[in-house]
Interface confidence: medium
């Protein structure tokens, strides 16, 4: 006899894992065989979906992998054409294992500003989301939270905050680890000991001290009256993200020295500066209060000039006499360039003579000063022009130091080789006589204030000049 | 970073030449004076020759005098000992060397790792 | 030409103190010699210590000073630290003649 169809096993909620087989079975008792549909959602599970297995005439509906997007109400209907259709529904949960679908990545962050590690993650039941600081659980507080995202959220970020993280995705299923990923904390440069300012004597090593720090860990570059350093050596060391500049200078002028700490933030770069002056104290005479040692000149301006391993006189209020005498003669030298031919011996001669004297050993080493009658020599009859133009520019202060005052002695100053002619220098170089003088052309308009003794030849001397001579 | 790099060293016949150079950076080449000091295997140092900030003149060993030349370029920021009529003796490892200041004998106070120089038939 | 002298060898106990010298064959040692020292540790290249008899240079540990002791030159390690195994060697500026600079056969100090 017909009979309607009656759904003997009513569907029931089915869990199933993402990947596994979930089965439905929807057993109906009829007479004739009934046509068993299936649908999800409301919508037709078609017969050819390779995704399904459809058996037993339609009673048994079988997902074959199951994927999280299945799940949702599975109903069957059961018709034969007697009675009406009848209809029994399920649910389909899906279990899912937790999975991070947008794990954290590698930050770099400047210090004081906002990190945000992402940490998405998927799985049924919701998996709870925490974080792991290098081996230990990351603690909340009221800088650090993770959202209910999962990201992990650090406000102000501090430069303990950088390290290793790894973001945990935990649910009854099992738990699921992100890769480690580094937040990286950069931290603009700051100067932490800025180099100080100096009074000092021409000639002096002055150390100037820069330390800085910040990461990147900075670079730092000094700069000297707005260019950079053309000097100097500059001695580096980097400790525990500090890094410690010295620049060692060899002062022969005032100067403005900047310390710049610089480091790069992605494109950008920060920067700090920090500056010193140094001034040059005024000279003390080089006949007051000399301390110094004699030894033998080693340099090699003043070769050609004084005697062969001549005993000079280093004056120790320099940091290192022979470098920064050597230097003074250096620099006067250059300016003797653009003098006469007839000027330039004699003034070389005088110069060499004056800022390396010769020394008297004795128990307190003495410098010998050159005689004033051959100073005169140099400035009346050889240099009457160049010393009239020197002098004339060191009043208008068109000299950027005091090194060329030094440089050239004050020769009312110099004692008279008539008074003791063992207590001051001559000048071997100086070779001529008062023979010589009658046929030299008068440089200046006054006499000579001193009568020009008759100088000594030097044997030794490498050239001798004399005033009528014409040198190229 | 100051540095002096040593090149050209290498092995040459008794009477044969050879010359070396000596690469500086990191510090202002022409303020300061520089040497070459040598090293016999086993032995002490040895100054060889030496030159000062603006190379107006050249000092050498009484031993290496007419056989050696140093010079130096100060565009290139670089020294040169050319070395001729090589003898088994110049056998060493040659140091170029910075000196403390200008003048051509303050003391050396930067040196390179050295270049080996080997006479031998 | 004048032959500058040194020790061979010296030995020093850790944080003792040692003086290595340094004279010239014939005649003394002065302030025209500009002596300094120079330490050089096994396939090292020479690293200078000391300038013009007494000067430190930058980087020097202060336990090591110049000075002249006699008619020579001395190089003083006041507490001497295992580091400091080296070989010593000084270098005098020979002013006459040639103008050359000599340098002396060297010291090899152990630290015991």
């Known amino acids: 006899l017909p009979k309607a169809p009656v759904i003997t096993t009513p569907l029931e909620t089915v869990d199933a894992l993402v990947e596994e087989v979930a089965t439905f079975m929807c057993a109906v008792e009829s007479y004739p065989q009934p046509e068993i549909s299936w649908t999800r959602n409301k919508i037709l599970i078609k017969l050819f979906d390779t995704r399904y297995s459809i058996r037993e005439n339609g009673q048994l509906l079988t997902i074959l992998s199951v994927e999280d997007s299945d799940d949702g109400i599975y109903c069957c209907t059961a018709n034969n054409g007697v009675g009406g259709a009848v209809e029994s529904c399920g649910a389909l949960q899906v279990k899912m294992k937790p999975k991070i679908t947008r794990p954290p990545i590698n930050v770099k962050i400047i210090e004081g500003l906002k990190a945000v590690l992402p940490c998405t993650t998927m799985g049924n039941p919701k998996p709870s989301v925490s974080w792991i600081k290098g081996d230990s659980p990351l603690r909340e507080n009221s800088r650090i939270a993770v959202l209910e995202s999962g990201s992990l959220r650090i406000h102000n970020v501090q430069k303990e905050d950088a390290g290793q993280y790894r973001c945990v995705a935990k649910n009854s299923l099992g738990t699921a680890y992100s890769k480690v990923v580094k937040l990286e904390v950069e931290v603009f440069a700051r100067i932490l000991r800025a180099p100080e300012s100096h009074n000092v004597t021409f000639g002096s090593f002055v150390t100037l001290h820069c330390t800085a720090t910040g990461i990147p860990v900075p670079t730092i570059t000094w700069i000297e009256n707005g260019n950079a350093v053309s000097s100097g050596s500059i001695q580096e060391s980097v400790k525990d993200r500090v890094i410690d500049s010295r620049l060692q200078l060899f002062i022969t002028k005032p100067g403005l020295y900047t310390c710049i700490a610089t480091n790069k933030h992605g494109e950008k770069f920060s920067t700090a500066k920090a500056a010193a002056t140094i001034s040059i104290a005024e000279w003390s005479k080089p006949q007051k209060d000399n301390k110094g040692y004699c030894a033998q000149y080693r340099g090699e301006v003043c070769n050609a000039v004084l005697a062969k391993d001549a005993l000079v006189f280093l004056n120790t209020s320099y940091a290192d006499p022979e470098e920064a005498q050597e230097l003074l003669v250096h620099t006067a030298w250059n300016e003797l360039k653009v003098v006469s031919p007839v000027c330039r011996p004699a003034a070389e001669a005088l110069l060499c003579n004056h800022i390396f004297q010769e020394c008297s050993p004795g128990v307190v080493p003495t410098p010998i000063p050159i005689c004033r009658e051959y100073c005169l020599a140099v400035k009346e009859l050889f240099c009457a022009k160049e010393w009239l133009v020197m002098e004339e520019k060191t009043h208008r202060g068109l000299y950027r130091s005091e090194m060329h005052l030094l440089s050239v002695p004050e020769c009312s100053k110099l004692p008279s080789m008539h008074w003791d002619p063992t207590a001051c220098a001559r000048l071997p170089h100086l070779d001529y006589n008062k023979e010589n003088l009658k046929t030299f052309p008068p440089m200046t308009s006054s006499k000579p204030s001193v009568d020009i003794p008759n100088l000594p030849s030097s044997s030794s001397s490498s050239f001798s000049v004399s005033p009528t001579y014409s040198m190229t | 970073e100051l540095q002096l790099v040593e090149s050209g060293g290498g092995l040459v016949q008794p009477g044969g030449s050879l010359r070396l150079s000596c690469a500086a950076s990191?510090?202002?080449?022409?303020?300061?004076?520089m040497s070459w000091v040598r090293q016999a295997p086993g032995k002490g140092l040895e100054w060889v020759s030496a030159?000062?900030?603006?190379?107006?003149?050249?000092y050498y060993k009484e031993s290496v005098k007419g056989r050696f030349t140093i010079s130096r370029d100060n565009a290139k920021k670089t020294l040169y000992l050319q070395m001729n009529s090589l003898k088994s003796e110049d056998t060493a490892v040659y140091y170029c060397?910075?000196?403390?200041?200008?003048?051509?004998?303050?003391?050396?106070?930067?040196w390179g790792q050295g270049t080996l120089v080997t006479v031998s038939s | 030409q004048a032959v500058v002298t040194q020790e061979p060898s010296l030995s020093v106990s850790p944080g003792g103190t040692v003086t290595l010298t340094c004279g010239l064959s014939?005649?003394?040692?002065?302030?025209?010699?500009?002596p300094d020292w120079y330490q050089q540790t096994p396939g090292q290249a020479p690293r200078a210590l000391i300038y013009?008899?007494?000067s430190r240079l930058s980087g020097v540990p202060s336990r090591f000073s110049g000075s002249f002791s006699g008619n020579k030159a001395a190089l003083t390690i006041t507490g001497a630290q295992p580091e400091d195994e080296a070989d010593y060697y000084c270098?005098?500026?020979?002013?006459?003649?040639?103008?050359?600079?000599?340098f002396g056969g060297g010291t090899k100090l152990t630290v015991l």
């Open positions: 030159i000062p900030w603006n190379g107006g003149s050249t």
């Open positions: 990191g510090f202002t080449f022409d303020d300061y004076g």
């Open positions: 013009s008899t007494n």
């Open positions: 060397a910075k000196r403390s200041g200008r003048i051509a004998f303050g003391a050396l106070d930067a």
């Open positions: 014939s005649g003394s040692v002065t302030s025209s010699n500009y």
């Open positions: 270098a005098l500026y020979m002013g006459s003649g040639s103008r050359n600079y000599v």
